[in-house]
């Protein structure tokens, strides 16, 4: 099997990516400058550590989590890094243009990078549904469209619904999931005869996927608390996320065993379900008043995740062409919705004293916010899917799906590397 790109893609990718990079450099040159206000080193280090945690989550966590395919592990990790690097650059500019541009130049702070990394994480969640079926040139398009759509969604939600940074970023779970699923729906689905083995998982890649899950598990409290305003909020968010992910691990492993006729544990279930609690508490992690509530949420999220992993892949594989091991999309869509529902419940409890009219109005606003996130995700996802189907990108042939050798140079072109 050839290890080279098709010639047209070899011409297309470097030209497309490097032109884009040059354009980004020019935009940074003309429109950005660093924050010049004084801040002592200790403050900077503390602020940078949060950004560092998010980068570890994105590069190592999500990079390795998606690397469980037998023949597509290299591409999963490296393409993730490529998308993260590109996504962060574009997200910094976009966030700056949308929020500060009228005042002149875009001021870059450590918070800008933190926010941009979280925006880029959205792409890394979505791409799980399409990795192995697209090339890098197509992924560049996906990054640009998704980061733009998320940035605009966040600005609209912030302006119309007056939500804070945390609340409008926590739509990322639902947004990323539905975006990824709608892109997958547009791509060619059936795997031709003889390629079924490629979307199966293998032991070593599965181990690296578990490593990715562990990194995400360790740093999820940082993600959920990164955009909160006060120390008490961050403390509560960290504690509640930790309790939730701890319980979802126990639930995932035991639930996976329970779901198997011989009581065996499924790697695929565990990879994804260990994170379930973190996604489910995301929206309300700082508001949960006691540990046991966070733990119950972690339990419910773990069960939903395992249940979803058992029953949804068949449907997703048929309808969306998503391989069995790429369960992040529907997992996050279910758990993200659970998180949003929990927040709506809190909102109802909060407005009880303010009269029935007030309850209806607040709930309507919250449902409107969620619906907007889903609609924009689906529409921009479909648009991306249609763009990715254009012939100019020279998408991999279905026979070359989930194959590292299409993209990478290997010294020994062995099939079972």
């Amino acid at each position: 099997m050839s290890s080279k790109y098709p010639r047209s893609v070899r011409r297309c990718l470097p030209l497309w990516a490097l032109t884009l990079e040059a354009a980004l450099i020019l935009l940074f040159y003309f429109f950005t400058h660093y924050d010049a206000s004084l801040e002592d080193q200790k403050g900077l280090v503390a602020s940078y550590q949060v950004g560092q945690d998010l980068t570890v989550m994105a590069a190592i966590g999500l990079g390795f989590l998606t690397s469980s395919f037998r023949r597509h592990s290299w591409s999963s990790v490296a393409f993730n890094l490529f998308m993260l690097a590109l996504g962060v650059q574009w997200a910094i500019l976009l966030d700056g243009f949308l929020s500060q541009f009228p005042s002149g130049k875009v001021v870059i702070t450590l918070f800008s990078i933190r926010l941009a990394t979280m925006s880029a994480l959205s792409v890394l969640i979505s791409v799980d549904a399409v990795l192995g079926k697209v090339n890098l040139a197509q992924l560049v398009v996906m990054v640009l469209v998704e980061v733009t759509a998320l940035g605009n969604l966040r600005m609209v939600i912030s302006n119309i619904f007056n939500t804070d940074y945390h609340m409008n970023m926590m739509h990322i779970y639902v947004f990323a999931a539905y975006f990824g699923l709608s892109v997958a729906w547009c791509l060619p689905k059936p795997l031709p005869e003889g390629t079924e083995d490629k979307d199966q998982t293998a032991t070593i890649p599965s181990l690296s996927a578990m490593l990715g899950a562990l990194f995400l598990w360790m740093f999820w409290p940082s993600f959920n608390s990164a955009l909160l305003r006060s120390p008490i909020e961050r403390k509560n968010a960290v504690f509640n996320t930790y309790y939730a992910v701890a319980v979802s691990v126990v639930t995932a492993i035991s639930g996976s065993s329970l779901a198997h006729p011989q009581g065996k544990i499924s790697k695929t279930y565990v990879h994804s379900a260990v994170l379930a609690g973190g996604v489910a508490v995301g929206t309300s992690c700082h508001l949960i008043p006691s540990p046991w509530l966070a733990m119950v949420l972690g339990l419910v999220a773990g069960l939903i995740s395992v249940g979803g992993a058992k029953y949804l892949p068949g449907c997703c594989n048929r309808v969306l062409g998503i391989p069995h091991s790429s369960i992040m999309g529907y997992n996050f869509s279910l758990l993200g919705l659970l998180g949003e529902i929990i927040y709506i419940v809190l909102l109802v409890l909060d407005t009880v004293g303010a009269g029935n009219g007030m309850i209806g109005f607040q709930v309507l606003l919250s449902i409107g916010e969620l619906s907007l996130a889903i609609v924009i995700a689906l529409m921009s996802g479909l648009l991306t899917g249609l763009l990715l189907n254009l012939k100019i990108w020279k998408a991999p042939h279905e026979a070359k799906y989930f194959d590292d050798q299409v993209f990478w140079k290997f010294p020994h072109l062995a099939v079972g590397f």
Epitope: E39, K42, G43, A46, S47, V50, T109, L110, F111, R114, N162, D164, Y165, R229, S230, P231, I232, E233, N236, H286, L287, P289, Y343, L346, L347, L349, D350, T351, G353, A354, M358, F361, Q362
Partner: antibody, heavy 125, light 105 residues
Framework: QVKLLESGGGVVQPGGSLRLSCEAS????????MHWVRQAPGKGLEWVAL????????SYAESVKGRFTISRDTSKNTLYLQMRSLSADDTAVYYC??????????????????WGKGTTVTVSS | VMTQSPSSLSASIGDRVTITCRAS??????LNWYQHKPGKAPKLLIF???NLQTGVPSRFSGSGSGTDFTLTISDLQPEDFATYYC?????????FGRGTSLDIK
């Protein structure tokens, strides 16, 4: 004892600049968000700017955006407000205040629990 | 927008005084009350609509939710003559009411 002490006020010409300082004692700026609030003669209180406890976010009132910059030096435990392109509308007593949060059911309630006595800024030709 | 009423109020020592604050949209219970005397630092009285700040006398109380809130001083003392402000913390920016000036009758 928790205290805030503002300084740096004075008379300045329209279009001029001024830097206000607010020295905190009894607590550390590293663990507290801080506000600047002003009161123009004969008017009510008007929120001006906020800096988060970790310095990561600065928010401004529309009336001062692009002209005022809130910053801090945690080694000196001091908050600053750099004011540029001043106009007569900026004439006021400027107060610094500590940001505090208490958990509500669906969000946090933020309030200003400690205030300084204020420093007067007069913009006049 | 926070609308305070009345804008000024005259009362006698020992009176029960009520100041109201109305929000243009529901702010649930995310409202604070401050007392301000000329030449002094403003002082937090009530946070989250009804919670008394530490050190504030119990004659001050806050109530209300949604759009209508009240600050009540049950037994007016000489040191209570000042200007009172409500402030919402439900959404940015953190707007104050125009103030109610309380003076001796």
């Amino acid at each position: 004892q928790v205290k805030l002490l503002e300084s740096g006020g004075g008379v300045v010409q329209p279009g001029g600049s001024l830097r206000l300082s607010c020295e905190a004692s009894g607590f550390t700026l590293r663990s507290s968000g801080m506000h600047w609030v002003r009161q123009a003669p004969g008017k009510g209180l008007e929120w001006v700017a906020l800096i988060w406890f970790d310095g990561s976010i600065r928010s401004y009132a529309e009336s001062v955006k692009g002209r005022f910059t809130i910053s801090r030096d945690t080694s000196k435990n001091t908050l600053y407000l750099q004011m540029r392109s001043l106009s007569a509308d900026d004439t006021a007593v400027y107060y610094c205040a500590r940001d505090k949060a208490v958990r509500g059911i669906s969000r946090y309630n933020y309030y200003m629990d400690v205030w300084g006595k204020g420093t007067t800024v007069t913009v006049s030709s | 927008v926070m609308t305070q009423s009345p804008s000024s109020l005259s009362a006698s020592i020992g009176d029960r005084v009520t100041i109201t604050c109305r929000a243009s949209q529901s702010i649930i219970r995310y409202l604070n009350w401050y007392q301000h005397k000329p030449g002094k630092a403003p002082k937090l009285l009530i946070f989250a609509a009804s919670n008394l700040q530490t050190g504030v006398p119990s004659r001050f109380s806050g109530s209300g939710s949604g759009t209508d809130f009240t600050l009540t001083i049950s037994d007016l003392q000489p040191e209570d003559f000042a200007t009172y402000y409500c402030q919402q913390s439900y959404s940015r920016p953190f707007t104050f009411g125009r103030g109610t000036s309380l003076d001796i009758k």
